[in-house]
């Protein structure tokens, strides 16, 4: 009976605080008045005072909004004592899991990525890989799952779809034939990273692709 299932609390809660989360209850309260307390990081040790307990009702209280990216899980201990201070239960583990909200945008690891590829290569040739990170959870939710896309290509010669990007790995590849260094020596791609697996917040960066020379022209006299 002296057990509490893991408690899930969304981060960035708006209150009002204190917010009652769950009730600690010992069945020894049938015999004697019970006083409840909690200990551990987030209660009586840093970060202090995030959680409290109503000492006679046993209600576990949240005092402020939580931030999953700061602390994703709290491990507290619940205690129950009688009026004379004698412990009536073994300390009980209380796990508080902070559930994720999509409160961070993706961030590219660089503002500008640079890569190169030989002119005249076949479609499917890999050019470079770009990377964006998102502090949100990507295991239990899609909040931190990033999808990559190409927003624009400059110049648009010989046409505007010379490259593609793998939506999950960020690998940029050649998709069309016709790369010709003598005509276009460099492409600038505006790339996007969007969280929620493509349905959330978007951030942009630039990928510069240098077209390397191949010995494809005979000398002119």
């Amino acid at each position: 009976d002296w057990v509490v299932a893991p408690i899930s609390v969304p981060e960035n809660g708006k209150g009002p605080f204190p917010q009652r989360l769950n009730q600690l209850k010992s069945n020894k309260d049938r015999d004697t008045k019970i006083f409840y307390s909690i200990t551990g990081p987030g209660a009586d040790s840093p970060p202090e005072g995030v959680f409290a307990v109503e000492k006679e009702t046993g209600w576990l209280l949240l005092n402020k909004p939580l931030d999953r990216e700061e602390i994703a899980k709290y491990e507290l201990f619940g205690h129950a004592v009688s009026e004379n201070g004698a412990s009536v239960e073994d300390p009980m583990n209380i796990s508080i899991i902070v559930t994720d909200q999509n409160d961070h945008k993706p961030k590219f690891t660089q503002d500008t990525f640079r890569g190169s590829v030989l002119e005249g290569v076949l479609p499917g040739t890999s050019v470079m890989q770009v990377t964006a990170t998102d502090e949100d959870d990507a295991i239990y939710t899609y909040n931190g799952v990033v999808a990559y896309s190409i927003h624009s290509q400059e110049p648009k010669d010989p046409h505007d779809l010379m490259f593609t990007i793998h939506r999950s790995t960020g690998t940029i590849s050649v998709i069309s034939s016709g790369l010709d260094r003598e005509k276009v020596p460099e492409y600038t791609l505006t790339i996007q990273a969007t969280d929620m697996d493509g349905d959330g917040s978007t951030t942009t960066a630039v990928a510069v692709v240098e077209i390397l020379d191949a010995n494809d022209n005979a000398p002119m006299f």
């Epitope: 209150g15 009652r20 202090e48 109503e54 000492k55 006679e56 009702t57």
Partner: antibody
Amino acid sequence: QVQLQESGPGLVKPSETLSLTCTVSGGSISGYYWSWIRQSPGKGLEWIGYIYYSANTNYNPSLKSRVTISVDTSKNQFSLKLSSVTAADTAVYYCSRGGSGSYWAFDIWGQGTMVTVSS
Amino acid sequence: DIVMTQSPLSLPVTPGEPASISCRSSQSLMYSYGYNYLDWYLQKPGQSPQLLIYLGSNRASGVPDRFSGSGSGTDFTLKISRVEAEDVGIYYCMQALQTPPTFGQGTKVEIK
């Protein structure tokens, strides 16, 4: 025996900021909810807001835009600031401790300090 | 906000006789396992309020056992089994369920 003592000016001019301090003696400020409550003839007893010892605050929505409560654990004190006061803020201001049985249950009160808002 | 309504607003009493004050809330103050988040305070003349009863029926430390609290949900009662002269003052109920806590308008108890 925990005791609370309010201090601060008894007269504040309209549009200025009311500032009061509550000193906690005979016990620690840790582990409790410390509130400010005021009492005026017109509105009766009105809860203003609280601070938990680790600096988490919560204010009455009707006063939220004007209230700041802060704590100095090293001095065992907590303070109230109420900005842009008007005559309607004239009242006896009490500091109190909550959190013994339920988190409100104000079990210890200061003796109160009368604050008049007048030019 | 939860509105608290007390009655009567004035209560003349005779020492040694019982007295009763009613308090009604605009919504239920019960919150699991039978806990009612309703507190009673007494403000004696010239003093600050003092906690009498918390969680509906629990006497605060040092409060004489002639004071008792009862009720559940939205209707609550404070009873004084035998009024003493020192019991005069204004009695307030307060809901402690939700932020902001709110007080009743007070019941003035005075000796006849």
